[in-house]
């Protein structure tokens, strides 16, 4: 089984009650935004056949991702919340940096993929669907890697 | 179609032991964690331990030593192996499937096997 | 480990009626709380998920909310088939997975 390094994130960065409130800020409105509510793109689908080691590397993957296809082509919409969630989100994305796994992780990259060609699918309202899901992101990031 | 039945239980010494077993049918045990649950009559819910999709184990404190949890892939099938066995044990036993959607949820359940433990 | 307090442990209610359940968490568990629903001699049944998710299949008079500590059921008009027992379950993440999963106590729903 592949063995999860540095996958950590200590539970101090989800505990700063402004910054939480913000990124769900953020979430709630580019949410009222998204008219395609039938698709979840953090759901059952992206953990399947993921083990609980592996949680981490997949959802710093889904971070990663976000972060450089999302966020930062959108960071002039959302204000002012997106100024200030993306760098939040952007120090967790530094300090999952070293986060590794050993072995084989295709079937990791499989789910983002899929996960990655709905958004591209579904164009703009991909993009504000996955920071209408920052929230579960949030979360997901915290349960997984903490 | 996902099916989990459990099956096993019985009748049971104190000091004796027994093996549960949860066939499930509808998904694969290597794409889901299971858990077991138990629930004393008349009484609440109480989580036993979890095997994960690598076959890694996970147990309530109260559990470890006397409880292993353990699968066959190949059966479609996972075990409940409890040892030294007490009255307080007695209880409906369920096995349920974990999902992780970003939080671990339990669905489906089995129907439950029971096990009663009496001289 | 996180302790679960659910209240009232039962309560009676009418077809009809407007019911809701509270579950009190020991810490904070943000919004890692699920609802199960028991009828008597079957399996629990997964109702909500995310403190607020309603599950595939569950009828939308049900709805939960609540984070941090303090959660709510609320059936908004209970119905014949809803007489049941109501547990709360929280998933605690970053302590031993020996605490990771806790249920409450449960609530049963009796009819008046």
């Known amino acids: 089984a592949p063995i999860s390094s540095h996958c950590r994130l200590d539970k101090s960065n989800f505990q700063q009650p402004y910054i939480t409130n913000r990124t769900f800020m953020l979430a709630k409105e580019a949410s009222l935004a998204d008219n395609n509510t039938d698709v979840r793109l953090i759901g059952e689908k992206l953990f399947h056949g993921v083990s609980m080691s592996e949680r981490c590397y997949l959802m710093k993957q889904v971070l990663n991702f976000t972060l450089e296809e999302v966020l930062f082509p959108q960071s002039d919409r959302f204000q002012p919340y997106m100024q200030e969630v993306v760098p939040f989100l952007a120090r967790l994305s530094n300090r999952l940096s070293t986060c590794h796994i050993e072995g084989d992780d295709l079937h990791i990259q499989r789910n983002v993929q899929k996960l990655k060609d709905t958004v591209k699918k579904l164009g703009e309202s991909g993009e504000i669907k996955a920071i209408g899901e920052l929230d579960l992101l949030f979360m997901s990031l915290r349960n997984a890697c903490i | 179609e996902v099916q989990l039945v459990e099956s096993g239980g019985g009748l049971v010494q104190p000091g004796g032991s027994l093996r549960l077993s949860c066939a499930v049918s509808g998904f694969s045990l290597s794409s889901y964690a299971m858990i077991w649950v138990r629930q004393a009559p008349g009484k609440g819910l109480e989580w036993i331990g979890i095997?994960?999709?690598?076959?890694?184990?996970y147990y309530a404190s109260w559990a470890k030593g006397r409880f292993t949890i353990s699968r066959d892939s190949s059966k479609n099938t996972v075990y409940l192996q409890m040892n030294s066995l007490r009255a307080e044990d007695t209880a409906v036993y369920y096995c349920?499937?974990?999902?992780?959607?970003?939080?671990?949820?339990?669905?489906?359940w089995g129907q439950g096997t029971l096990v009663t433990v009496s001289s | 480990a996180v302790v679960l307090t659910q209240s009232p442990s039962s309560l009676s209610a009418s077809v009809g009626d407007r019911v809701t359940i509270t579950c009190q968490a020991s810490?904070?568990?943000?919004?890692?709380l699920a609802w199960y629903q028991q009828k008597p001699g079957k399996a629990p049944k997964l109702l909500i998920y995310w403190a607020s998710t309603l599950a595939s299949g569950v009828p939308s008079r049900f709805s939960g909310s609540g984070s941090g500590t303090d959660f709510t059921l609320t059936i908004s008009s209970l119905q014949p088939e809803d007489f049941a027992t109501y547990y709360c379950q929280a998933v605690v993440y970053g302590n031993s997975a020996d605490s990771r999963y806790t249920f409450g106590g449960g609530t049963k729903v009796e009819i008046k």
């Open positions: 810490e904070d568990i943000y919004t890692n």
């Open positions: 095997i994960d999709i690598d076959g890694s184990t």
């Open positions: 349920a499937r974990d999902r992780f959607v970003g939080v671990d949820i339990f669905d489906p």
